[in-house]
Interface confidence: medium
């Protein structure tokens, strides 16, 4: 079951999936000046069995002719406003989810892929948040959001994270940025486009894990 919405946005924070549940789709996007090959896949799909998961299909990009009028796959500025772009400085990995059954690792890059990766998450997916460079969390522990199914509708749990500028003590950013529609009450048709910018997963554990800038759920 695909998640209806994108994970919540938090001011001055980014999110990252450490691994992707089976059923997750990744759009085959190409950078400006390139397009999918005609017979190429529209997306990659995380599939597998109880012992091994992997990405089906391969994304392939080819050069667009300069006179080609086909719309670029890379989002234009207006389109990008509607898409969630996240950029994590040095993602921590609280647990090696990628080694869990039923999860795929971050797909390797393909030639001439777009700078954004657009994922379609499924129920049960977890993403982790951290403050961007220059900001620190006012809470401690891992901040995560999970896509859950409740009363037949999907929703993301709210990560309890507030990121505040270390240099700007006059600024105290708040909480989640609006979703495309309220939980369980779609106001308009929304696609499940979740993007990550230049995310190639980093598997090393951060040295700062003890003083993690992630935050925890209520216990």
């Amino acid at each position: 079951e695909l998640c209806d919405d994108d994970p919540p946005e938090i001011p001055h924070a980014t999110f990252k999936a450490m691994a992707y549940k089976e059923g997750t789709m990744l759009n085959c996007e190409c950078k400006r000046g390139f397009r999918r090959i005609k017979s190429g896949s529209l997306y990659m799909l995380c599939t597998g069995n109880s012992s091994h998961s992997s990405w089906d299909n391969q994304c392939q990009c080819t050069s667009s002719a300069t006179r080609n009028t086909t719309k670029q796959v890379t989002p234009q500025p207006e389109e990008q406003k509607e898409r969630k772009t996240t950029e994590m400085q040095s993602p921590m990995q609280p647990v090696d989810q990628a080694s869990l059954p039923g999860h795929c690792r971050e797909p390797p890059p393909w030639e001439n892929e777009a700078t954004e990766r657009i994922y379609h998450f499924v129920v049960g997916q977890m993403v982790y948040y951290q403050c961007v460079q220059g900001y620190r969390a006012l809470h401690r522990g891992p901040a995560e959001s999970v896509c859950k199914m409740t009363h037949g509708k999907t929703r993301w749990t709210q990560p309890q994270l507030i990121c505040t500028g270390e240099m700007e003590t006059s600024q105290f950013p708040g909480e989640e940025k609006p979703q495309a529609s309220p939980e369980g009450r779609p106001e308009s048709e929304t696609s499940c486009l979740v993007t990550t910018t230049d995310f190639q997963i980093q598997t090393e554990m951060a040295a700062t894990m003890e003083t993690s800038i992630f935050t925890t759920e209520y216990q």
Partner: antibody, heavy 116, light 107 residues
Framework: QVQLVESGGGVVQPGRSLRLSCAAS????????MAWVRQAPGKGLEWVAV????????YYADSVKGRFTISRDNAKNTLYLQMNSLRAEDTAVYYC?????????WGQGTLVTVSS | DIQMTQSPSSLSASVGDRVTITCRAS??????LNWYQQKPGKAPRRLIY???SLQSGVPSRFSGSGSGTDYTLTISSLQPEDFATYYC?????????FGQGTKLEIK
């Protein structure tokens, strides 16, 4: 079940001091930012101060800066608001709230009356 | 500081009515807006966060919309328990600020 219980309110003369406390339970207090919000009788709401989980970051409304101090004791799961040089305009119900998510859980409030 | 102005300041309506409350910010708050409901002698209760996301446990008759500086809270069909005071609140920048409130009364 998250619970926030304020105490320490009362009647005080202008220029005097008062310390409010907020006892927290039902969650890992030491992991969460906390805040004080006040509401003058028949008036609207005003954020007063916010403190980070470890007390290293504190933020104050201009109206209380230099007079009020927010602090916390994570060992006791308690949030404090030290109010000095109190003025008549500080008369209000003071609410303790979890700072995360801009006010999700609130206490029942404690009334502070500044009057001569 | 960002000033938040609500209108109307008070409103009379009947059960079943559709009600709209507006909130205007003195500068763009990038949709970082909460709506609260408060009943006499009680602490505020958050209804909506991030302009349009419904707080868990809040009835779906409440909805929010808006962007930039102008925001709206709508109650699609008033219920007896909805008569209260409503506040908008920005969290785009500190100090977070509330609107002055809109008192919703029974006609």
């Amino acid at each position: 079940q998250v619970q926030l219980v304020e105490s320490g309110g009362g009647v005080v003369q202008p220029g005097r001091s008062l310390r409010l406390s907020c006892a927290a339970s039902g969650f890992t207090f030491s992991n969460h930012a906390m805040a004080w919000v006040r509401q003058a009788p028949g008036k609207g709401l005003e954020w007063v101060a916010v403190i980070s989980y470890d007390g290293s970051n504190k933020y104050y409304a201009d109206s209380v800066k230099g007079r009020f101090t927010i602090s916390r004791d994570n060992a006791k799961n308690t949030l404090y608001l030290q109010m000095n040089s109190l003025r008549a305009e500080d008369t209000a119900v003071y609410y303790c709230t979890t700072g995360w998510n801009s006010g999700y859980d609130w206490g029942q409030g404690t009334l502070v009356t500044v009057s001569s | 500081d960002i000033q938040m102005t609500q209108s109307p300041s008070s409103l009379s309506a009947s059960v079943g009515d559709r009600v709209t409350i507006t909130c205007r910010a003195s500068q763009s708050i990038s949709s970082y807006l909460n709506w609260y409901q408060q009943k006499p002698g009680k602490a505020p209760r958050r209804l909506i966060y991030g302009t349009n996301s419904l707080q868990s446990g809040v009835p779906s008759r409440f909805s929010g919309s808006g962007s930039g500086t102008d925001y709206t809270l709508t109650i699609s069909s008033l219920q007896p328990e909805d008569f209260a005071t409503y506040y908008c609140q920005q969290y785009n920048s500190w100090p977070w600020t509330f609107g002055q409130g809109t008192k919703l009364e029974i006609k």
